[in-house]
Amino acid sequence: MMTGTIETTGNISAEKGGSIILQCHLSSTTAQVTQVNWEQQDQLLAICNADLGWHISPSFKDRVAPGPGLGLTLQSLTVNDTGEYFCIYHTYPDGTYTGRIFLEVLESSVAEHGARFQIP
């Protein structure tokens, strides 16, 4: 039975040209995390494999940095980066947990972080 929950940075906003950290945290389970995938829509941005470390998709190498921790840093943001991001935790023996983050990239300098929220 899957008992874990994923806490994410929730709905967030950032300025065009700036950077943002996408963070998820898996709690309430003793399952072993084998890999975390970061996806935007259906595109894979990065993989953090427990054994092998980080893989950044070649098309995002210039603008995506691994970490901190299992999180992901997006740099040189553009308005096109607005949208949904997913952290997908592959765990043993529970299976897969998915967290969702919505990022809005703003033209102005009034970007504010949204509240944290949980996805069971």
């Epitope: 084998t34 890999q35 995938n37 996806e39 259906d42 595109q43 894979l44 993989i47 494999n49 054994d51 092998l52 470390g53 893989h55 070649p58 592959h90 897969t96």
Partner: antibody, heavy 122, light 107 residues
Framework: QVQLVQSGAEVKKPGASVKVSCKAS????????MNWVRQAPGQGLEWMGI????????SYAQKFQGRVTMTRDTSTSTVYMELSSLRSEDTAVYYC???????????????WGQGTTVTVSS | DIQMTQSPSSLSASVGDRVTITCRAS??????LNWYQQKPGKAPKLLIY???SLQSGVPSRFSGSGSGTDFTLTISSLQPEDFATYYC?????????FGGGTKVEIK
Amino acid sequence: QVQLVQSGAEVKKPGASVKVSCKASGYTFLSYYMNWVRQAPGQGLEWMGIIDPSGGRTSYAQKFQGRVTMTRDTSTSTVYMELSSLRSEDTAVYYCARARYPSSWPYGTDVWGQGTTVTVSS
Amino acid sequence: DIQMTQSPSSLSASVGDRVTITCRASQSINSYLNWYQQKPGKAPKLLIYAASSLQSGVPSRFSGSGSGTDFTLTISSLQPEDFATYYCQQSLLTPFTFGGGTKVEIK
């Protein structure tokens, strides 16, 4: 040219260990992950594990956990795969295979060794 | 572990035929799917990586498509040297499992 040359055929008794080598040449050894894949007679391909020659990090298929050890010698650009507690079902051709993309793993394996036949028989 | 199911397990075709081999993953693997060709007594050869990218030196009659869980390898016009066994492999999540193979034989 890019090449992987493996050690010669081995005949082992059940319970013994075997260590297969794979010497790389023609590219930057530290930049490419190395996979090990085996193929039993008349059967399909079976992924065993992978090693990062740069840091020595490894990931093994659960099936081989505790029996397989992958190592590397950076001075000779050689990776090794040791399989212990051999049984007859381990009779197979063992291949080393280089990851296609530098410093990463998800894009297949573009260069393969010639294969090493390991026969386990009493 | 992710299970990879190939179909058919074997097929008979003639030179010039269009051949399609399918591979299904037990869960989404995005586009992290590779195709290999193997001839008897030889090491496998990479044909397609990342579901649809043609490996350097591979003839353009080979093509790959699909994403998520369903993938296809197509040989547009089968040549005599294409009679071999073909394997799919997912490389998203360790262990990087292979499909059972599809043997393409001469009709």
